[in-house]
């Protein structure tokens, strides 16, 4: 009842709590002398469902049969209406419509850790829409039964709050959950388990790693576990990898030797635990331990290449270049490179440690036979030295690769192809393809790139340090013993017409012809490999088509003679440059009048 109901009563039959789809009878009756004064026959009793009138009757009582009530709570209120007055509330009642609980499903229990508490979960099934009490019951050895009740509205979890101990780890316990409300009850199927089944160990903690004698091959992982743990599984991976290595161990007692770790690598380690070979569940993975393995001496050998440059009649400049070892070969932080230069006949040797670069330049006499050895050193030792005899790499004309071509191959790649040299092709031990950005001054500071190719290959795809719209000088060397031959070509991965033409800086008269000198187009405006220059000229005030002279591009050329100008005529001259993609806009215009006689 929802208020004091002084004037009358509302009764509900068969009950205030009904099964969905049931019918209820609601009776509203006035108490004696509580009707309308003087006009008791005029009593009008009205029944409201929430705020909606559903029935009325004149007299001292009203009966109403109600069907089709929805799930949940419905409020009925009975009011009295008298003539010339407001309706007076008599009494009311709430009716609760629901269903009996369904059988709870999938009951499962777990204890997190040997000191944890037992908690069980289940699926309630559909909502009953009524207050439903759940009782979790556990039957165990010694004829004991533990139980706990759930006070939550939607109960699908209960924690007993106490701990199952391993005193008889194989003893059976049986759990069951029972749901009860006003319309019925239902129990889950029993779930039977032992201590070993439901205890999920805590993840291992205090994980440490030790390297005996700072060696990666003598590595032990240590951790702490709960006392009853029998099995562990370890997983580890380099920090930059997504794939784990897995190891299962039995009776490890908190330690395990790892034999396959790579040196100088940061690893992530995690451990999980289990109490029994085939019962129970694995713990969560432990927190990660991150640790770097110690260095080992480098393996592998440096890839070394060199350039020779003539200085004068007695001296030459040698520039050595080498590539970093891969991480797996370096096996540590490379502290320095050791370069040894030796004159083979006289036996003089010079050793130098290089830090921070992968190149070295020195000047040596042009006479004698010279060799270099280069090795990489970390804190544990040095790589095997790479030995190279310094020779004239392009001396043997018969070893020069033939028909060298360079073609763009997709974005920032150049495909270099060649034919074997005329001399016995089987004499070639390897090819080296070398490339560097083309700088008109032949700048030796420009980085050098190279790759090695097996003697049976006649092509190489170069992609390292290749930029679009840059021209590269590409050389292919064929090496055979202490001899080498080479051929070169210019190539680019992507090209377009140059952004500007050459700048004419001088025009001079020489014996009836003129010599035009120009400044090279800045590298960043060439937009690829230049194929030709064009020199245009026409008479100053003429509308005729200009004449032109096309000159094949050569790196070092910065002047060209023209001998077809008429004397005492003023000409306008300008230049353009061409790549395979087209011609530049023209450069500056210069006027010139030839003073002498025509040839």
């Amino acid at each position: 009842k929802i208020d004091a109901c002084k004037r009358g009563d509302v009764t509900v039959k068969p009950s205030h709590v009904i099964l969905l789809g049931s019918t209820v009878n609601i009776t509203c009756s006035l108490k004696p002398r509580q009707g309308c004064f003087h006009y008791s026959r005029r009593n009008k009793l009205i029944l409201y469902k929430f705020d909606r009138r559903i029935n009325f009757h004149h007299g001292h009582s009203l009966n109403s049969q109600v069907t089709g009530l929805p799930l949940g709570t419905t409020l009925f209120v009975c009011k009295l209406a008298c003539i010339n007055s407001d309706e007076i509330q008599i009494c009311g009642a709430e009716i609760f419509v629901g269903v009996a609980p369904e059988q709870p499903q999938n009951l499962s229990c777990i204890q997190k850790g040997e000191q944890g508490t037992v908690a069980c979960t289940w699926e309630r099934g559909r909502d009953t829409h009524l207050y439903t009490e759940y009782t979790l019951q556990l039957s165990g050895p010694k004829n004991l039964t533990w139980q706990k009740q759930c006070k939550d509205i939607y109960c699908d979890y209960l924690d007993f709050g106490i701990n199952l101990t391993p005193e008889s780890p194989e003893s059976n316990f049986t759990a069951k959950v029972t749901a009860v409300n006003s319309l019925g009850s239902s129990s889950s199927l029993p779930s039977t388990f032992t201590f070993l089944d439901i205890v999920r160990p805590l993840p291992p903690w205090d994980i440490r790693i030790k390297f005996q004698k700072a060696s990666v091959s003598r590595c032990t992982l240590y951790w702490r576990d709960e006392g009853l743990v029998l099995l562990n599984r370890l997983r580890y991976r380099p920090s930059n990898s997504r794939l784990w290595n897995m190891v299962n161990v039995t009776k490890a007692k908190g330690r395990h030797d790892l034999l396959d770790l790579k040196p100088f690598t940061e690893y992530e380690f995690q451990i999980s635990s289990k109490l029994h070979l085939y019962k129970g569940s694995w713990s969560d993975w432990s927190e990660s331990l991150r640790a770097q393995t110690p260095e080992e001496e480098p393996t592998g050998m440096l890839d070394v290449w060199y350039m020779k440059r003539h200085i004068d009649y007695s001296r030459q400049q040698i520039s050595l270049f080498w590539k970093n070892l891969s991480v797996s070969e370096a096996r540590g932080k490379i502290l320095h490179y050791q370069v040894t230069l030796q004159e083979l006949t006289g036996g003089k040797a010079m050793t130098q440690n290089i830090t921070g670069h992968t190149s070295w330049t020195t000047v040596i006499p042009r006479t004698g036979n010279w060799a270099v050895a280069v090795s990489a050193a970390n804190s544990k030792g040095s790589s095997l030295p790479t030995r190279i005899n310094i020779m004239n790499l392009c001396e043997a004309g018969l070893l020069a690769p033939r028909q060298v071509s360079a073609n763009s191959e997709g974005m920032d790649n150049i495909l270099v192809t060649w034919q074997p040299p005329r001399k016995d092709p089987s004499a070639v031990q390897e090819y080296v393809v070398e490339w560097r950005e083309l700088h008109p001054g032949g700048d030796t500071q420009v980085p050098l790139n190279w790759l090695r190719s097996r003697p049976y290959n006649v092509s190489a795809l170069i992609s390292e340090n290749i930029k679009s719209y840059i021209c590269y000088e590409i050389r292919v060397y064929a090496l055979s013993g202490d001899q080498g031959g080479c051929s070169s070509i210019l190539g680019n991965s992507k090209h377009k017409a140059p952004l500007s033409g050459p700048h004419i800086n001088a025009i001079t008269e020489e014996k009836g012809s003129i010599l035009i000198s120009w400044n090279s187009i800045p590298v960043q405006e060439q937009m690829g490999c230049l194929l030709h220059y064009r020199i245009y000229w026409k008479e100053r005030d003429s509308n005729s088509q200009p004449q032109l002279c096309e000159i094949p591009y050569r790196v070092s050329q910065n002047s060209h003679p023209i001998n077809s100008l008429q004397p005492r005529v003023t000409y306008v001259l300008w230049m353009t440059a061409l790549t395979a993609a087209g011609e530049s806009s023209h450069g500056n215009e210069r006027e010139f009048c030839l003073q002498g006689k025509a040839n």
Partner: nanobody
């Protein structure tokens, strides 16, 4: 100083009911496991019922359904409601208290630190 005082014992006909009370002073009942044990003449003390601090209850199957343990935190007291009493329920009933956190420990008398003096229950046929 911790004290446990039982009351509510007496004589009753078979099939009757009794409600035993255990008033506790010096400790809070909701922080401890509370137990009831009984000892019949010439027999060992046996476990009857217990409630953990987390309100998990435990009963031997022999009394389950006839006996209910409950506690009133406000009154700092524990109760044992006994229905459908049988002559074999005749014994001295003891209230006990201890910091027990295990399932098995709730039914073990050596896990309880504090004990009352006991109250006599006699069931006649």
């Amino acid at each position: 100083q911790v004290q446990l005082q039982e009351s509510g014992g007496g004589s009753v006909q078979a099939g009757g009911s009794l409600r035993l009370s255990c008033a506790v002073s010096g400790r809070t009942v909701s922080d401890y496991a509370m137990g009831w044990f009984r000892q019949a003449p010439g027999k060992e003390r046996e476990f009857v019922a217990a409630m953990s601090s987390s309100e998990t209850t435990v009963y031997p199957n022999s009394v389950k359904g006839r006996i209910t343990i409950s506690r009133d935190n406000a009154k700092n007291a524990v109760y044992l409601q006994m229905n459908a009493l049988k002559p074999e329920d005749t014994a001295v009933y003891y209230c006990s208290m201890g910091p027990i956190v295990t399932f098995q420990g709730l039914a073990r008398q050596n896990e309880y630190h504090y004990w009352g003096q006991g109250t006599q229950v006699t069931v006649s046929s």
